[in-house]
Amino acid sequence: MKVLQEPTCVSDYMSISTCEWKMNGPTNCSTELRLLYQLVFLLSEAHTCIPENNGGAGCVCHLLMDDVVSADNYTLDLWAGQQLLWKGSFKPSEHVKPRAPGNLTVHTNVSDTLLLTWSNPYPPDNYLYNHLTYAVNIWSENDPADFRIYNVTYLEPSLRIAASTLKSGISYRARVRAWAQCYNTTWSEWSPSTKWHNSYREPFEQ
């Protein structure tokens, strides 16, 4: 039994890091393998992650981590019984994939303005809380070409757009994702989408 593709890990910078790897053949990850991880810090304890299958030869492990900060560095040991298959390290702050924003809501009762709001996926005492910026994707269910991205580079989790920038009388969907420039993160997954019917009063033509 050998590792074909070494583990690569990403952290949500809150409580979970996800590591994926591939073996050289079909493997029952949960019964045959264990991923041990330990913070390089005084008093730290070794933890064991039981991997799940991710395709025939693929494995995935969800590492539980408390109080993740930039200085953290973890040793990783992949074991098959008594055999050490791979040894490495992982610094969560250098491989961050933020959690997806939640509670996306479209407020249509503001005069001819659409207000989109969502929730920051981190609590205020998490270091990512004040460093997230967002991308909002709006698209028409009727017209695949009517697809747009709004970059929200301020910290407030909201976006205002004029209803007239979208077509009236049709349904739209929106979703939002997040990233943090200061940690050079990847984009989060998209939030669940929300749907609304866009309607506004056309201005009278002279």
């Epitope: 008093l43 304890e45 900060v69 930039s70 200085a71 953290d72």
Partner: antibody
């Protein structure tokens, strides 16, 4: 919100022991390390030790080895720092602080005066 | 005995800029991250900077940190009278299983 509430001021005689408490609230107590530091009057900060509330393991600064004991009570989300064989130079404000590599939350401090 | 050296005192007029240095070695600052704490008279220290240069929520951008080699610097611009306090750098010692260490402290006086 995160709060670390420390016990009140103490006056002790040389040779006695003191036990200072630090009650945590507003977060998952066992998920964060707790440090203790002290500050003598007009002096700088001095690290004393650390406790992992999850398992109760500790590590102490060499200077305090054998004199300091840090414990925790998960049922009340409280950590304790006991310093024995007190001498006049132990007169200081004692702080608990939450964190690993740096400390974002601090208790207000407990003044311990050692005087005969 | 602290192995991180800071100037005992610095001073500047309101609105000016001041810097506070923190000098260490390869087994601490050179191989670690630096944090900075502000201690107003009669109060507990407060985290100003972590990760060498990042600010926690609520800390104004007048405060900034940097690190180069075995030294670190805290800069405060647009000085205000309320900034008068003691400032401490902090890091950890990689030669003693990551025990934290503090600087000697710097008293900032706003003239």
């Amino acid at each position: 919100q995160v709060q670390l509430v420390q016990s009140g001021a103490e006056v002790k005689k040389p040779g006695a022991s003191v036990k200072v408490s630090c009650k945590a609230s507003g977060y998952a107590f066992t998920s964060y390390y707790m440090h203790w530091a002290r500050q003598a009057p007009g002096q700088g900060l001095e690290w004393m030790g650390i406790i992992n509330p999850s398992g109760g393991s500790t590590s102490y600064a060499q200077k305090f080895q054998g004199r300091v004991t840090m414990t925790r009570d998960t049922s009340t989300s409280t950590v304790y720092m006991e310093l024995s064989s007190l001498r006049s130079e132990d007169t200081a404000v004692y702080y608990c602080a939450r964190g690993k590599w740096w400390w974002q939350y601090w208790g207000k401090g407990t003044l311990v005066t050692v005087s005969s | 005995q602290s192995v991180l050296t800071q100037p005992p005192s610095v001073s500047a007029a309101p609105g000016q800029k001041v810097t506070i240095s923190c000098s260490g070695g390869s087994s601490n600052i050179g191989n670690s991250y630096v944090s900075w704490y502000q201690q107003l008279p009669g109060t507990a220290p407060k985290l100003l900077i972590y990760d060498n240069n990042k600010r926690p929520s609520g800390i104004p951008d007048r405060f900034s940190g940097s690190k180069s080699g075995t030294s670190a610097t805290l800069a405060i611009t647009g000085l205000q009278t309320g900034d008068e306090a003691d400032y401490y750098c902090g890091t950890w010692d990689t030669s003693t299983t990551y025990h934290p260490i503090f600087g000697t402290g710097t008293k900032l006086t706003v003239l």
